[in-house]
Amino acid sequence: DAHKSEVAHRFKDLGEENFKALVLIAFAQYLQQCPFEDHVKLVNEVTEFAKTCVADESAENCDKSLHTLFGDKLCTVATLRETYGEMADCCAKQEPERNECFLQHKDDNPNLPRLVRPEVDVMCTAFHDNEETFLKKYLYEIARRHPYFYAPELLFFAKRYKAAFTECCQAADKAACLLPKLDELRDEGKASSAKQRLKCASLQKFGERAFKAWAVARLSQRFPKAEFAEVSKLVTDLTKVHTECCHGDLLECADDRADLAKYICENQDSISSKLKECCEKPLLEKSHCIAEVENDEMPADLPSLAADFVESKDVCKNYAEAKDVFLGMFLYEYARRHPDYSVVLLLRLAKTYETTLEKCCAAADPHECYAKVFDEFKPLVEEPQNLIKQNCELFEQLGEYKFQNALLVRYTKKVPQVSTPTLVEVSRNLGKVGSKCCKHPEAKRMPCAEDYLSVVLNQLCVLHEKTPVSDRVTKCCTESLVNRRPCFSALEVDETYVPKEFNAETFTFHADICTLSEKERQIKKQTALVELVKHKPKATKEQLKAVMDDFAAFVEKCCKADDKETCFAEEGKKLVAASQAALGL
């Protein structure tokens, strides 16, 4: 499907508006520190060039690859070395090494100021004054903070962002209309970013085979009526889409995603009965809807799995002839029968099955050797079931905030070397599994909980990779993608950790805490809790609870005081002394 000019091809396929938006996202994800105006200038230059290629595909440079064109453009940025340091060395390389170099310098935790939401009237004025710039700025700010955000999905978020302002800036109570919508977009956006980050980590750290296995399991759960060949085709196409997006090939990714949505909708009769509504929507909504569509009903009277995968005399022959296809069939058949299992559990079962066949098919009596393979699955299934049961009970007993605190303590004791902000962020997100999943019936709890935990633990893994401080984190993150959660669950208190020196400054609070939102106040308290555990890793739950209760009372008291700052200074000293005594510091 060769085109004389790739840039012209993508411009024509995507249209000018999407082309410009995707180039802006691509540039902001690569050069995360560059000012907005510089990016807009680069995007306009690329767009004008693309238009010349649409007019004449044989024009000069129109035959160059997108990586060459975009890389050349990024390398014209004057302040590259001052702003990005060694990333500037990428520009001395040729493609494809130059693009790989840019990818390696993407920063999951860029040193950027927190996005502060202006007053509603200020936002509405900015929106009305220059809608185009306002929306571009949204794309830019999200993309630079989330360098792996799924670009075609970000276009969908931007469309909803625009719709929110269009509707609410005309409303009688603008704030009441707009703020909940913006909160929802922010929360959904963070979740979407984290889910995509796991897909990219899966592809980049564990390879295409790992991603395809994940996709076979998930699509088989979602489309249990589809034939294996159909699922395989969807997996191949989906893998191409995500490989492109994770590799920075955003134009190709968006174009291929649109083609995939078109194919799914044209073939919904052989895929799923749940796609009808999705397929009536416009492109961006359609693709989003398909990605989130509920599982179809399982076909009635599916035969036992044992017939083809244990009892058949052809198991080893079939496995030897096409190992990955046979394992793919196993995964497909198991997953379509088990929407109640997490994808990672299904992958663990497939791995166990593979390991058994590798061993048994080379044995003297293969069938005798693998006859009981399904019995090996039982403990693998029970482990997450029990863990979820215990943690949902704890969540229901404590509520979200205190459940997060329990996880903060648990994880700080496991990996105390990890930075406090990372421990707070990750543990807070781990704690959200309770309100997200524990409300579900048994049949939906495990896929909700364990697959969500995989996303959150991947955040820990990518943040830790930037500044590795714990061999235990590195080990759990790199050994096996599907066993990350069991690996972290199995970690006990790190006995090798030397407690942090006590620093009173860490526990000094000021009146500004009183004006913070409830969420920000929780984060302050949780930060203090992590620091406490780092000082006293052997502190008991009761000791920590007592100190935290005292701390909460102290904040409440001083925030009610007339002279807040004095209260924080004097009462704070007393609290620190009492805490030290209580914990034996």
Partner: nanobody, 123 residues
Amino acid sequence: EVQLVESGGGEVQPGGSLRLSCAASGFTFSTSGMVWVRQAPGKGLEWVSTISDDARITVYAESVKGRFTISRDNAKNTVYLQMNSLRAEDTAVYYCATYRAGSRIGSYEDYYRGQGTLVTVRP
């Protein structure tokens, strides 16, 4: 493009031996399982033997077990079939084959196959 070229066939007396070879190209041989199938005059395709990508797993049809040995050399992109104690009923065209994406496992008509090499066993 996938190419499989068989050689080593010929005429042999009952109880004799032959070694068939199959040179492969156009695909990643070292990650592909390989198969020998045969077609006797006027009959359909019959599976003979399979060897896994790393040669750890070998499987044989009951009719050839103990007489035939499949092997491979990944450095040479070649698969072999050592045939001993040959019988009249082993007379057939022998094909080397490998799985073709999208086909059903064991549906040898749909696999990539070579042009075959004729083995004739007669007194």
